[in-house]
Interface confidence: low
């Protein structure tokens, strides 16, 4: 069919709650493209009717909610004027036994986020919620071992749970919960987070090393397209998140409306002792407001930035 397969993504998900996956692959999805979702190589596209339990919402596929029978491989086809790319997403649906102690509390599935708090420090946990604009998320509640978290040491700030003076007792099974509203109906979104405690400064005893960028400036002409890679080496068993931020906000969130600046899909190369990760940032069109602003690559506790600057005028042309 002439479409190029880009990659396969595996997701293990909880039944009975919403799930969304966004078909983005900068810079391919940045231009004039059409995005269509299919299930299990079906020739019939996923419905775009918002009342459908499973439907396409712009570039997203949205499940309201996931059900057992939704397991399978979904394809997202990105068609440009002269190109066709396909992303495969393998979804596996499980029933989670959230609070049934006889089953052992939160299950250790791969859709759970493993996060680390640093002993004696002020630290935070993050609730990762990714849904299209049609979904309105209410305030986030946090639970530990199925009890709502309360107390002076804990503060909820947007999608984060701030924990002051982390103690050994803070390890355990957490969950963040939000009520999602879509077309007047409400659903529960629940993410399990397994939290461990470390005394070391780095994550898992190793601080990720950002090879590039190196806190430097890049000369770039106004109006041009720019792609910058963030290259990170880290241990094979690391649980660090790698991302690009501006003004302490994920670039995909900061430029949510215009989508002018986007974070790419992370890739990695495996070596014997470590992994080399790459996640890029794409500026579809550099604007004046981008100059002088630090664009930060984050990898666990490590950060490095680039600053765009206008090239010095070339007086030889005169």
């Amino acid at each position: 069919d002439g479409c190029k397969d880009i990659f396969m993504k595996n997701e293990i998900l909880s039944a009975s709650q919403p799930f969304a996956f966004n078909c983005t692959f900068p810079p391919i999805t940045s231009g004039e493209v059409s995005v269509t979702w299919y299930k299990n190589s079906s020739k019939i596209p996923v419905s775009k009717i918002i009342q459908s339990r499973i439907h396409q919402d712009e570039t997203w596929i949205l499940f309201l909610p996931m059900e057992w029978g939704d397991s399978g491989v979904y394809q997202c086809v990105i068609k440009g004027r002269d190109s066709c790319h396909r992303i495969h997403v393998n979804l596996t649906v499980f029933e989670k036994h959230w609070c049934d102690t006889s089953i052992g509390g939160l299950p250790n599935l791969s859709d759970e986020y493993k996060q680390i708090l640093h002993l004696g420090k002020d630290d935070s946990l993050t609730c990762h919620l990714h849904f299209p604009k049609s979904c309105v998320l209410g305030p986030i509640k946090w639970y530990k071992d199925c009890n709502e978290i309360k107390g002076e040491r804990f503060t909820v700030l947007e999608t984060r749970l701030l924990v002051s003076n982390v103690s050994a007792e803070d390890r355990g099974n957490y969950a963040c919960q939000a009520i999602l509203t879509h077309s007047g109906k409400q659903y529960e979104v629940l993410n399990g987070i397994t939290v461990s405690i470390t005394e070391r400064a780095g994550y898992g005893g190793s601080v990720p090393k950002i090879i590039y960028p190196k806190n430097h400036s890049i000369e770039v002409q106004l109006g041009t397209t720019l792609i910058v890679d963030c290259n990170v080496t880290d241990t094979k068993d690391n649980t660090n998140l790698r991302c690009w931020r501006v003004n302490n906000t994920l670039v995909d969130d900061y430029y949510d409306e215009s989508k002018r600046i986007r974070e790419g899909v992370e890739t990695h190369v495996s070596f014997r002792e470590h992994n080399l990760y790459t996640v890029n940032i794409t500026f579809l069109e550099v604007k004046m407001e981008d100059y002088g602003l630090p664009f930060m690559c984050h990898a666990g506790v490590s950060t490095a930035y680039i600053i765009l600057q206008l090239p010095a005028p070339d007086f030889r042309a005169y």
């Epitope: 339990r53 909610p65 059900e67 959230w98 609070c99 049934d100 199925c146 659903y187 629940l190």
Partner: nanobody
Framework: DVQLVESGGGLVQPGGSLRLSCAAS????????LGWYRQAPGKQREAVAT????????YYSDSVKGRFTISQDNAKTTVYLQMNSLRAEDTAVYYC?????????????????????SGQGTLVTVSS
């Protein structure tokens, strides 16, 4: 709109049995937590029994453990409360409720009532 309709209440002698049913309509999705709470005249409401949306987790208050059983039909749109060995102190209006959160404390017998929808109630009277 979501509606919860209870049935099966009535007058029963001590030691007798009743089966309450709650039919949920208007759902386009499976609720996370269905269950029953009761309120006797002049008393605090009490979570009696709850079942998670998948039917995988149940909760019973200490006062009904071993006597009451909560269950769902296969379509998960009706929830039942089988009440055996009824006592005078079980006399109350029984309400069906549907909660959005499987982690809501109500789902596990907590005192905060985080259910989203509630029915009109059905009266259960245990008397000789």
């Amino acid at each position: 709109d979501v509606q919860l309709v209870e049935s099966g209440g009535g007058l029963v002698q001590p030691g007798g049995s009743l089966r309450l049913s709650c039919a949920a309509s208007g759902y386009s999705y499976r609720t996370q937590c269905l269950g029953w709470y009761r309120q006797a005249p002049g008393k605090q409401r009490e979570a009696v029994a709850t079942i998670s949306g998948g039917g995988t987790s149940t909760y019973y208050s200490d006062s009904v453990k071993g006597r009451f059983t909560i269950s769902q039909d296969n379509a998960k749109t009706t929830v039942y409360l089988q009440m055996n060995s009824l006592r005078a102190e079980d006399t109350a209006v029984y309400y069906c409720a549907a909660g959005l959160s499987v982690l809501g404390s109500w789902c596990h017998g907590g005192s905060s009532y985080e259910y989203t929808y509630s029915g009109q109630g059905t009266l259960v009277t245990v008397s000789s």
